[in-house]
């Protein structure tokens, strides 16, 4: 495939990435499919600078980011490194919380009205980000 | 990589009081929830208690609560369980398990309850 | 209280075989299911999270499904390296709860 120079049409660029912001909500796995329909994937947070550029643009709504922790450890859609990666959970999260009745505990990461991070039920709809690389290579063939 | 080391368990006589220590290592300790299991000689696995990341959230199992007190200090990547009331039936090898489906687990320590 | 019945309790299989091992739950736990391996003398490993999903590291030819209540636990061709004790546990609600195991015995 080619590789990728511009972003799509409605998408914001940003320090080599593009974003597209949702407006309406969706679980999480069908946001991070969503996504993955365009070629892209839930954003992914790696630095304070790309947290307050999301945060600007999300405004004061949950929203759904690529981090879960569906089979334990909490990981990143990307394979970017939970462990040694940027993080801005709210005090005492993520708390795993039983506590709403839906069954299981919380195990998908949202942006919340203040922009930190909470982990919720993954089934609830949010809105949600998407990221793709403009360095990455596109699916797309290439022109011939 | 992710370590889980128990330490604190012992010969004890009924009605007395141990306390158990998991030190945790490899990972962010401080954004996982921590459980304690146990597993009697010969017998299955019982889950005893869990605690969420920052301790806002505690349960046990009915046969030890108000005996047993799980605690955690993310400072220093520590777990704990205060078992008091020690009975004879207590006696088991006691493992700690990070999140509620259990995905790494410690070596375990074996605790005797007997006089 | 969620009770997970585990059958069969014990099993013996020859090495090649396709083992298969089930799980009910007392009531719907929303795929909220583990499996886990125990030897003798040592700690559990973790195979299988949601019901499905193997963790990482676990060979392919343990495979788990299922849904509601009703679970299974499915090796396809034992390995010497497989005999051992399987337990089932649910996390959709506290108490959490295991099964009582399956000891997978050589024939």
């Known amino acids: 495939g080619s590789e990728r120079t511009c972003c799509p049409v409605n998408w914001v660029e940003h320090e080599r990435s593009c974003y597209w912001f949702s407006r309406s909500g969706k679980a999480w796995a069908d946001a991070d499919n969503y996504c993955r329909l365009e070629d892209a994937h839930l954003v992914v947070v790696t630095s304070w600078e790309e947290q307050k550029f999301v945060q600007h643009h999300i405004g004061p709504v949950n929203t759904w980011m690529g981090l879960h922790d569906q089979n334990g450890p909490w990981k990143w859609v990307d394979g970017t490194d939970y462990e040694t990666g940027f993080k801005n959970w709210r005090p005492e999260q993520p708390d795993d919380w039983y506590g709403h009745g839906l069954g299981g505990g919380e195990d998908c990461a949202h942006f919340t009205d203040d922009g930190r991070w909470n982990d919720d039920v993954c089934q609830r709809p949010y809105r949600w980000v998407c990221e793709t690389e403009l360095d990455k290579a596109s699916q797309e063939p290439p022109l011939l | 990589e992710v370590q889980l080391v128990e330490s604190g368990g012992g010969l004890v006589k009924p009605g007395g009081s141990l306390r158990l220590s998991c030190a945790a290592s490899g990972f962010t300790f401080s954004s996982y929830n921590m459980n304690w299991v146990r597993q009697a000689p010969g017998k299955g696995l019982e889950w005893v208690s869990s605690?969420?990341?920052?301790?806002?959230?505690?349960y046990y199992a009915d046969s030890v609560k108000g005996r047993f007190t799980i605690s955690r200090d993310n400072a220093k990547n520590s777990l704990y369980l205060q078992m008091n009331s020690l009975r004879a039936e207590d006696t088991a090898v006691y493992y700690c398990?990070?999140?509620?489906?259990?995905?790494?687990w410690g070596q375990g320590t074996l605790v005797t309850v007997s006089s | 209280d969620i009770q997970m019945t585990q059958s069969p309790s014990s099993l013996s299989a020859s090495v090649g075989d396709r083992v298969t091992i089930t799980c009910r739950a007392s009531q719907g736990i929303n795929n909220y299911l583990a499996w886990f391996q125990q030897k003798s003398g040592k700690a559990p490993k973790s195979l299988i999270s949601v019901a499905s999903s193997l963790q990482t590291g676990v060979p392919s030819r343990f495979s788990g499904s299922g849904s509601g209540t009703d679970f299974t636990l499915t090796i396809s061709s034992l390995q010497p390296e497989d005999f051992a004790t399987y337990y089932c546990q649910q996390y959709n609600s506290y108490p959490l709860t295991f099964g009582g195991g399956t000891k997978v015995e050589i024939k």
């Open positions: 398990a990070r999140v509620n489906l259990f995905d790494y």
């Open positions: 605690i969420s990341s920052s301790s806002s959230y505690i």
